[in-house]
């Protein structure tokens, strides 16, 4: 015997209170697949999160981060503060990259300059806090 709930499309739930008819998801909820017994609460993009895509009856809301922050984690589960190029985020805030390291993005950590000598090359352009060194031809 086929489960009558399998006929309920996305955007509805199978309503046990009404002989398993398909009822529409309440406002601020959704069901992205058919045959669901309940709808799911829509994600709310509050505080440092902002709404990238509104919730609909068939799909959850999607959030991104307000300016000055960037997304981390699956589905932008967290927002992390941006730093300037040439900096990295520490527990005490944004700190300049130490000598010999660089960061060319507003996120992530400072990475060591390339060691040109490992490839038998010379340094063509010196590195900065914001840019890696440019290796030149072999001396």
């Amino acid at each position: 015997l086929q489960d009558p709930c399998s006929n309920c499309p996305a955007g509805t739930f199978c309503d046990n209170n009404r002989n398993q008819i398909c009822s529409p998801c309440p406002p601020n909820s959704f069901s992205s697949a058919g045959g669901q017994r309940t709808c799911d609460i829509c994600r709310q993009c509050k505080g440092v999160f902002r709404t990238r895509k509104e919730c609909s009856s068939t799909s959850n809301a999607e959030c991104d981060c307000t300016p000055g922050f960037h997304c981390l984690g699956a589905g932008c589960s967290m927002c992390e503060q941006d730093c300037k190029q040439g900096q990295e985020l520490t527990k005490k805030g944004c700190k300049d990259c130490s000598f010999g390291t660089f960061n060319d993005q507003k996120r992530g950590i400072c990475r060591p300059w390339t060691d040109c000598s490992l490839d038998g090359k010379s340094v063509l352009v010196q590195g900065t806090k914001e840019r890696d060194v440019v290796c030149g031809p072999s001396p």
């Epitope: 739930f13 309503d15 209170n17 009822s23 998801c25 309440p26 406002p27 601020n28 909820s29 017994r37 309940t38 709808c39 799911d40 609460i41």
Partner: nanobody, 122 residues
């Protein structure tokens, strides 16, 4: 036991107005998310309007925005739907509904009343 008793429906001409009432017992309308669903002849249920987030926000279906207003009287434990500029397509049975949030994040709703018939016709 939760009970919802709708009233205020009737026959009205296009462009006319009605106010539906829903007297609730067994729960407090000011402490719950509540609203109105309707069922037009031969069609499924459709959400019309709701008061959400314990009164922090309201929802209206696109088809009724600017024409319908949801409100409640906490002292009378009653929910209202003021309907104006009524159209033939608003003809339906209107049910008061209580949104139910289940453990684990599921959402459904209860309609315990018999509904009230609204017919818009000239």
């Amino acid at each position: 036991e939760v009970q919802l008793l709708e009233s205020g429906g009737g026959l009205v001409q296009p462009g006319g107005s009605l106010r539906l009432s829903c007297a609730a017992s067994g729960f407090t309308v000011s402490a719950e998310d509540v609203g109105w669903v309707r069922q037009a002849p031969g069609k499924g249920l459709e959400w019309v309007s709701a008061i959400l987030d314990k009164g922090g926000s309201t929802y209206y279906a696109e088809s009724v925005k600017g024409r319908f207003t949801i409100s409640r009287d906490n002292a009378k434990n009653t929910l209202y739907l003021q309907m104006s500029s009524l159209r033939a397509e608003d003809t339906a049975v209107y049910y008061c509904a209580r949104i139910v949030y289940h453990a684990g994040g599921g959402v459904t709703f209860d309609t315990r009343g018999q509904g009230t018939q609204v017919t818009v016709s000239s």
